[in-house]
Structures are given as C-alpha cells and as structure tokens.
C-alpha cells in the first residue's frame, strides 16, 4: 500500500529574467527512492537518478540546474515558463509519487516574494 | 511484448513527400517520449526528429528542420513523420525508436522502413 | 554540434578476448553518453546508458566508463554473438549525434 505524502512549494510566482527553485519532499514512507523525474507539463525537464545522479533534458540544458537536492532550479524565467510542473519519484517498492508545483511567471516587479524555497 | 512497426517507406523522386509511420503497441504510448532515427545505406545512425509525449513540443537538427514534421496520434499509438522536398541525401532506412523512461537514450526501436529519393 | 569519433573503426578480436572500443565527443557531454550495438539487417540495440549503467537485460561483459569527453566500452570476454557494430551516442545537448560506429570481427 502507498503510504507516503508528496510536499511542494504549491503555487509559486517569480518575476520574469528570475530564477526560481522547484521543490517536492516526499514523507510518511519508508520506500527507497530510485530516480526523481521533473516534468513541465509536456516536457520532460530532468532526471536525478539515486545512483547516477542528474541528466538535464538538451531542450533545457541552458536554463535548468540540477538541485538543491532532488529540487530543480530553473533560470531565465520566461513568461512563457509559467504552468504546472511535476516532480514524479519512482519508489522501490511503493511505486510511483507525483508532486504538482503551479509556477506563474509576472512581467514585473509584481511577483510574491513569500514563497519558502523561491530565490531572491 | 513492445514493438514499433514503420511503414511508408518507398521510391521518391527529389523534391518529393513521404509519410512515415509508425505503429506500437505493448506499452502505454502517450507515457513515451519518440524519435525518429536513420540510416543512409553503409553509413552510421544520425537523429532525425524527437516530439514529447503529449506531442506539444518537437526537436529537429538543422539537416532536416523546415522540411520534415514528426507528429503523434496517441488514440492511434502511431508516430509519424512528414517528409517534404526531399533530397537525394535523405536516402536511408528510418526507425522510429522509444525513449527510456529512466534517461534520453532509445530503448527500444522499430526494424525500419527504407525510404529511397532517386530521379 | 558535439562530433562524437569513435576508434578504431575496426577491430579484429578472437571469441573469448576482451575488446576494447573508444569514443570522445568534441567537447564536455559530462555523463551523457549511451552505447548501441548493432547486427547486420538489424535495429540498433541499447547496451549502455549514463555512460556506465547497463540496460535491463545486457550482460555483465558489457560495461561502460568515462566521463567528460572520453569514453570506453568493454566488451570482457567477446562471444559470437556479440561480433556487430557499436555506436556511441551524446544526449547532452542538440542535435544528438552518434559516432561513426566501430566493427567489431572476428579475428
């Protein structure tokens, strides 16, 4: 049975040319996690596989950095960056967990600076 | 059991259109992430196009971009690409091939159709 | 475009011996490296990826290493069944390129 609970920074907004720190935790579980999987809606962005570590997606590579952690940072911020994005953990042996971050990217100075895990 | 089927290979004269396909079944197709790939006779594997799973977005090297159109039909689990003013250059077996669901390399790949572009 | 060149172009190994092929991209693909195998009237076959990890179902004679613009495959004990020809592929950044492939026969 899947016990475990995935944490996220939930909405988020940055200003665009920004960066920003996409984070999931995922808790309550005693699974081993074999590879986190970011996702920006169609798009696979990057992989951190436990053992081997991060591959960024060539369609992101200049844009997307691997971490802190299992996070993602994304920078260069577009307004075209804004959508849903996913953080899918494979478990061994729970199977898979799925995390929904909403990111909205604002043309000016009017961005929230409240989020916990954004960059200033 | 996974497997990809091309078809719509054939002869063509330069500046003409093709339409490949490519058929799957025994894994969920709109979960994967597809290629196209080919082969000119005797030479080595080069990258032709790359589409997302939902199909939003694609990928092309410069060899082939404006000319050729990857597309999807995930009701159909069907991949296709559309080959326009083709050269004689673009002479090769094509396969289309699945992205890992682990990495970006191809784990599994069709057998091929072989499109020929000849006056 | 990174230029994926792989060597020797080919090589003449005895069943049994280890085989020893070579790949280096033109600049920095870090672990970004997959290696494909691949039969005469066959699709290619995906033997290794992350330049090291082998994929489900490749036995152990098969392994990878490298990082950054140098890369290796060895093959430890050739069988018969593994005479082909073995391409190295960058997924670093596009276009994707592959290597001129490298033959390996039967001595």
């Known amino acids: 049975m899947m016990t475990g609970t995935i944490e996220t920074t939930g909405n988020i907004s940055a200003e665009k040319g920004g960066s920003i720190i996409l984070q999931c935790h995922l808790s309550s579980t005693t699974a081993q996690v074999t590879q986190v999987n970011w996702e920006q809606q169609d798009q696979l962005l990057a992989i951190c596989n436990a053992d081997l570590g991060w591959h960024i997606s060539p369609s992101f590579k200049d844009r997307v950095a691997p971490g802190p952690g299992l996070g993602l940072t994304l920078q260069s911020l577009t307004v075209n960056d804004t959508g849903e994005y996913f953080c899918i953990y494979h478990t061994y042996p729970d199977g898979t967990y799925t995390g929904r971050i909403f990111l909205e990217v604002l043309e000016s100075s009017v961005a929230e600076h409240g989020a916990r895990f954004q960059i200033p | 059991e996974v497997q990809l089927v091309e078809s719509g290979g054939g002869l063509v004269q330069p500046g003409g259109s093709l339409r490949l396909s490519c058929a799957t079944s025994g894994f969920t197709f709109s979960d994967y992430y597809m290629y196209w790939i080919r082969q000119a006779p005797g030479k080595g594997l080069e990258w032709v196009a790359y589409?997302?799973?939902?199909?939003?977005?694609?990928y092309y090297p410069d060899s082939v971009k404006g000319r050729f159109t990857i597309s999807r039909d995930n009701a159909k689990n069907t991949l296709y690409l559309q080959m326009n003013s083709l050269r004689a250059e673009d002479t090769a077996v094509y396969y289309c091939?699945?992205?890992?669901?682990?990495?970006?390399?191809?784990?599994?790949w069709g057998q091929g159709t072989l499109v020929t572009v000849s006056s | 475009e990174i230029v994926m060149t792989q060597s020797p172009a080919t090589l003449s190994v005895s069943p049994g011996e280890r085989a020893t092929l070579s790949c280096k991209a033109s600049?920095?693909?870090?672990?970004?490296v997959a290696w494909y195998q691949q039969k005469p009237g066959q699709a290619p076959r995906l033997l290794i990826y992350?330049?090291?990890a082998r994929h489900t179902g490749i036995p152990a004679r098969f392994s990878g290493s490298g990082s950054g613009t140098e890369f290796t495959l060895t093959i430890s004990s050739l069988q018969s069944e593994d005479f082909a020809v073995y391409y190295c592929?960058?997924?670093?950044?596009?276009?994707?390129?592959f290597g001129g492939g490298t033959k390996v026969e039967i001595k």
């Open positions: 592929q960058q997924y670093s950044s596009y276009p994707l390129t």
């Open positions: 091939a699945r992205q890992t669901n682990y990495d970006f390399t191809m784990d599994y």
């Open positions: 992350w330049a090291s």
């Open positions: 589409i997302t799973k939902g199909g939003g977005s694609t």
């Open positions: 600049q920095d693909v870090g672990t970004s």
